[in-house]
């Protein structure tokens, strides 16, 4: 069965690196379910689409999510 | 320095066991998915097998899945690959390989040195 | 499954430029990634994302992917650029990572 459409976690390995939010086109979180048991977080750069799983136990990576809704909410009316 | 080290091949009859080891060190292991990579002699690379870095998804080549096991110990710093019900065209140099962090695109930044198993009667 | 496909080998005079292909349907649409193996040693990542380059691997080689066929170019060939390339795709019909049969560089 590919592993795309296994009901799995996806996320193989972990970044803990600072992302620059500038840098990121998307930031998927997919929340802990019954088929996986962790928080997994998908960032999606702009350069080239390249997707990483970044570890949301990173303070870094915390960091990156309060700058990202902070930006968000500045949008939003 | 960062680098992965093999061991465990050796000379093995038809139907036997092995177990390889791979040894990580200089960079954070427990964050990084982890493979086997094989190349038969002469031959060139085939994908074996990836475990993640918590070690709770494994997957497989088909023609090595019921027979091998992929596993770590993190707290180790360690890889393994339990072959079991060898085959002699499981006879290659088996590498372990580290995991570039790309989501749902694998390949390969580090490799180690490789460890050669031989499965002859 | 995605099969690709490279030349058994390829020569080259030292000083000239190297041009190593992997052939597949639509490549261009996937990331390639090259890598080189010397005589004995393991396999080094040389070229990711079509024409990314790792630190420490020359500005020499280089990498470009459109159409159906992916490309590793080696300029200024070197006696120590003699080896096995492999280009490697993630296949997502069958989710899992795929190389070229491998191409045999030798410097003349």
């Known amino acids: 069965v590919p592993l795309s459409r296994t009901v799995r976690c996806t996320c193989i390995s972990i970044s803990n690196q600072p992302v620059n939010p500038r840098s990121l086109e998307k930031l998927e979180i997919i929340p802990a379910s019954q088929f996986c048991p962790r928080v997994e977080i998908i960032a999606t750069m702009k350069k080239k689409g390249e997707k990483r799983c970044l570890n949301p136990e990173s303070k870094a990576i915390k960091n990156l999510l309060k700058a990202v809704s902070k930006e968000r909410s500045k949008r939003s009316p | 320095q960062v680098q992965l080290v093999e061991s465990g091949g050796g000379v093995v009859q038809p139907g036997r066991s092995l177990r390889l080891s791979c040894a990580a060190s200089g960079f954070t292991f427990s964050s990084y998915g982890m493979h086997w990579v094989r190349q038969a002699p002469g031959k060139g690379l085939e994908w074996v097998a990836v475990?993640?870095?918590?070690?709770?998804?494994?997957y497989y080549v088909d023609s090595v899945k019921g027979r091998f096991t992929i596993s770590r110990d993190n707290s180790k710093n360690t890889l393994y690959l339990q072959m079991n019900s060898l085959r002699s065209e499981d006879t290659a140099v088996y590498y372990c390989?580290?995991?570039?962090?790309?989501?749902?695109?694998?390949?390969?930044?580090?490799w180690g040195r490789g460890t050669l198993v031989t499965v002859s009667s | 499954n995605f099969m690709l496909t490279q030349p058994p080998s390829v020569s080259v005079a030292p000083g000239k430029t190297a041009r190593i292909a992997c052939g597949g349907g639509n490549i261009g649409d996937k990331s390639v990634h090259w890598y080189q193996q010397k005589p004995g040693q393991a396999p080094v990542l040389v070229i990711f994302?079509?024409?990314d380059r790792p630190s420490g691997i020359p500005k020499r080689l280089s990498g470009s992917n459109s159409g159906n066929t992916a490309t590793l170019t080696i300029s200024r060939v070197e006696a120590g650029d003699e080896g096995d390339y492999y280009c490697q795709v993630w296949d997502s019909s069958s989710d899992r990572p795929v190389f070229g049969g491998g191409t045999k560089l030798t410097v003349l």
């Open positions: 475990i993640s870095y918590d070690g709770n998804n494994k």
């Open positions: 994302y079509d024409s």
């Open positions: 390989a580290r995991d570039s962090g790309s989501y749902l695109d694998w390949y390969f930044d580090l």
